[in-house]
Amino acid sequence: AFGISGVQKYTRALHDSSITGISPITEYLASLSTYNDQSITFALEDESYEIYVEDLKKDEKKDKVLLSYYESQHPSNESGDGVDGKMLMVTLSPTKDFWLHANNKEHSVELHKCEKPLPDQAFFVLHNMHSNCVSFECKTDPGVFIGVKDNHLALIKVDSSENLCTENILFKLSET
């Protein structure tokens, strides 16, 4: 897993940026873990970044992700945490110029290097669930969420609202 200095260096620059015509409401660095307290980690392997879900050793530092929050510009009937039909969306960046992307064809979650404006595949609708957990729904594919499968992140189709509480699509965010 790599450090967060790169993220910290460009956090301020992002505040002034405009992504798909809108600026983030707020941004902050947080570690991402599963409902069962496994950490989401990122590693550079063969010139590309891999995403892992793993138990960290006691004193091992958690990787941080820069979360940028946006308000959807157009009203929506989706079930995100919105009032008056608008939703909160988020992008997740673990290191400079790389963002989590939904690859709907492969049902995978990947880290892609890209320039702004970010593609829709980098945006996820934020849902706030019980125990202050969150889930991330693909903007490009409603009903499909980031989830955990075989110690990796994957895209998981959620068929009904009852399955929104399925543990494998619930994540915890922590600033500590």
């Epitope: 409401i25 707020t26 969150v134 965010l173 922590s174 600033e175």
Partner: nanobody, 124 residues
Amino acid sequence: QVQLVESGGGSVQPGGSLRLACAASGRIFVISNAGWFRQTPGKEREFVASISRHGEITNYADAVKGRFTISRDNSKNMMYLQMNSLNFEDTAVYYCATTLGHSPRTDPGDFDSWGQGTQVTVSS
């Protein structure tokens, strides 16, 4: 901007308990740090407790440590303050507030949305 409404205030005897609730409307509550403050007549608003966006970081004023507990439920857009072992010095109007700034926050000036307040009176 978040709209905040406090409830749960009232009169209680020394040693008693109250649970304050803060109902938030506005989608950005869930990405806001939040806190409780209190004010007595003629004095400045003072920090009581604060909580991070997802509840994992909490801070308390020395005067309430061990007696008060702050919590939140983002799925309901709610924040709470459980107040135990109340004493006369806890009598005040209690306000909830939120900020998009980074936690921890204890200065009232850092908070941009405020409720109208709820009165807590400790008397025998």
